[in-house]
């Protein structure tokens, strides 16, 4: 009779993480008598996966009933596969011996690779806000996937970006991998409502890529533009001076009125008007009593936006004997009246 052979028909198999892996093994003869054992790897550090005769292997079940006398199928099923289970599995026939069984024949081995889904991509932006026309970097990370092949794309408001660099680690084979990508994005004044999207496609996702997003509202700072104007009011001796603070983001803003360099009033922006592009407008006004001063007065609207250095716009009120003849930029003998924001 021909000598027993151990047949492992599958050179390699691929299994999704969390599923079960079936490792096939048959023998061609019932002789010699002796058990089967399964190992992962070979060499001095090989790992026992299943022993037919003894031991507790909670994740391993046999496909056939090994207690049947004529059984020649020693296939096993390993449940709840993780990337750490990847490797080459050997079905080894032992010959009955005393006191120990003796290794007799080995199968050729089955290489198990594990497919694992990538984690949801996490997109993070810069720690500090940046202003339009500046380039900022966004990072995207996803972990725990296998096999190594993966595709990552960046989008801004649906438009694919091209300025990015991606690394998959480790460089060589591993039980699982991580991807890290950095994209450069040029900010514009219209980006308050914009989104940056990182999209990851992998064989385990069956054509339904994972996405991570970052809102540019958390990254952008749009500095305000200031305009100071005056309009006469019905009372002859009063002028209404307004400071229009336009197109700023985020909302955090403090405004100070100065009269000839001296602080007159400070207020924090509260009731704001939102523009379509997500930026805000605000207006503060002063009623100026023109009868109290003989000299010209410089009025300054000073704005501190989002903790940045203050910006200001000044307006000269010129003293004149004929207040009704003043142009829109001057008024005689100013004095600051009690005024409130709109």
């Amino acid at each position: 009779e021909e000598e027993l052979q151990v047949i492992q028909p599958d050179k390699s198999i691929s299994v999704a993480a969390g599923e079960s892996a079936t490792l096939h093994c048959t023998v061609t003869s019932l002789i010699p008598v002796g058990p089967i054992q399964w190992f992962r790897g070979a060499g001095p550090g090989r790992e026992l996966i299943y022993n037919q005769k003894e031991g507790h292997f909670p994740r391993v079940t046999t496909v056939s009933d090994l207690t049947k006398r004529n059984n020649m199928d020693f296939s096993i099923r390993i449940s709840n596969i993780t990337p750490a289970d990847a490797g080459t599995y050997y079905c080894v026939k032992f010959r009955k011996g005393s006191p120990d069984h003796v290794e007799f024949k080995s199968g050729a081995g089955t290489e198990l690779s594990v497919r694992a889904k990538p984690s949801a991509p996490v997109v993070s932006g810069p720690a500090a806000r940046a202003t339009p026309q500046h380039t900022v970097s966004f990072t995207c990370e996803s972990h725990g996937f296998s096999p190594r092949d993966i595709t990552l794309k960046w989008f801004k408001n649906g438009n694919e970006l091209s300025d990015f660099q991606t690394n998959v680690d480790p460089a060589g084979d591993s039980v699982s991998y991580s991807i890290h990508s950095t994209a450069k994005v040029v900010l514009t004044r219209e980006d308050v409502h914009s989104q940056v999207i990182c999209e990851v496609a992998h064989v385990t996702l069956q054509g339904d890529p994972l996405r991570g997003t970052a809102n540019l509202s958390e990254t952008i700072r749009v500095p305000p533009t200031l305009e100071v104007t005056q309009q006469p009011v019905r009372a002859e001796n009063q002028v209404n001076v307004t400071c229009q603070v336009r197109k700023f983001y985020p909302q955090r803003l403090q405004l100070t009125w100065l009269e000839n360099g001296n602080v007159s009033r400070t207020e924090t922006a509260s009731t704001l008007t939102e523009n379509k592009d997500g930026t805000y407008n605000w207006m503060s006004w002063l009623l100026v009593n023109v009868s109290a001063h003989r000299d010209d007065v410089k009025l300054t609207c000073q704005v501190e936006h989002d903790g940045q250095p203050a910006v200001s716009k000044s307006h000269d009120l010129k003293v004149s004997a004929h207040p009704k003849e003043q142009g829109s930029n001057t008024a005689p003998g100013p004095a600051l009246a009690s005024a409130a924001p709109l």
Epitope: G41, P44, T88, S106, E111, G172, D173
Partner: antibody
């Protein structure tokens, strides 16, 4: 196809140091362990030890502890053998040899070998 | 573990059947491989797990044995088979090779 290409022959004086490279291609470098094997002229093969290319951890056979070091440059898919304080007995051909098993935690047999690097130590 | 190849040289003829033996100093199960090495070349794997023929190796090469006694058989000797043959155990550290058997034509 899978290839292991070693650096060229070296002529060294006793007491010097030699560093041999083994550049791997055709497979993913960090999946498979790399062993080093010595063959003195007209002699048999001696396993010197191996390096786990994933973790970078190396194991030296007792006879090769002390003057022998294994290292990696993963980005260049290259393994290195360095021998310090060379003696005449180090004159040999040194082979790198790749393990058959992905994610193996010990070497076994060697399906792939470099072409060998002859190191000659002579005063 | 010492792997002993007692025959340093073996004379053979083309189409002959040749058996090269290797003895382990202790039980190594079937953790044995066989290599062929031609002059000036690196070793080439023939057999692993004592009896499994490696991919692409002609079927005239057969391995057998377990425990301590192992044999590599060439059933139909060819001129290209003239080489040195080494056994190797990988049952325990350090991995060890036999001293080799050189096949030559009678």
């Amino acid at each position: 196809q899978i290839q292991l290409v070693q650096s060229g022959p070296e002529l060294k004086k006793p007491g010097e140091t030699v560093k041999i490279s083994c550049r791997a291609s055709g497979y993913t470098f960090t999946t498979y362990g790399m062993s080093w094997v010595k063959q003195a002229p007209g002699k048999g093969l001696r396993w010197m030890g191996w390096i786990n290319t994933y973790s970078g951890v190396s194991t030296c056979a007792d006879d090769f502890k002390g003057r022998f070091a294994f290292s990696l440059e993963t980005s260049a898919t290259t393994a290195y053998l360095q021998i310090h304080n060379l003696t005449n007995e180090d004159t040999a051909t040194y082979f790198c040899a790749r393990d058959p098993h992905s994610y193996g935690n010990s070497p076994a047999w060697f399906p792939y070998w470099g072409q060998g690097t002859l190191v000659t130590v002579s005063a | 573990i010492v792997m002993t190849q007692s025959q340093k040289f073996m004379s053979t003829t083309i189409r002959d059947r040749v058996s090269i033996t290797c003895k382990a100093s202790q039980n190594v199960g079937i953790s044995v491989a066989w290599y062929q090495q031609k002059s000036g070349q690196s070793p080439k794997l023939l057999i692993y797990s004592a009896s499994n023929r490696y991919t692409g190796v002609p079927d005239r090469f057969t391995g057998s044995g377990s425990g301590t006694d192992f044999t590599l058989t060439i059933s139909n000797m060819q001129s290209e088979d003239l080489a040195d043959y080494f056994c190797q155990q990988y049952s325990s550290y350090p991995l060890t090779f036999g001293s080799g058997t050189k096949l030559a034509i009678k």
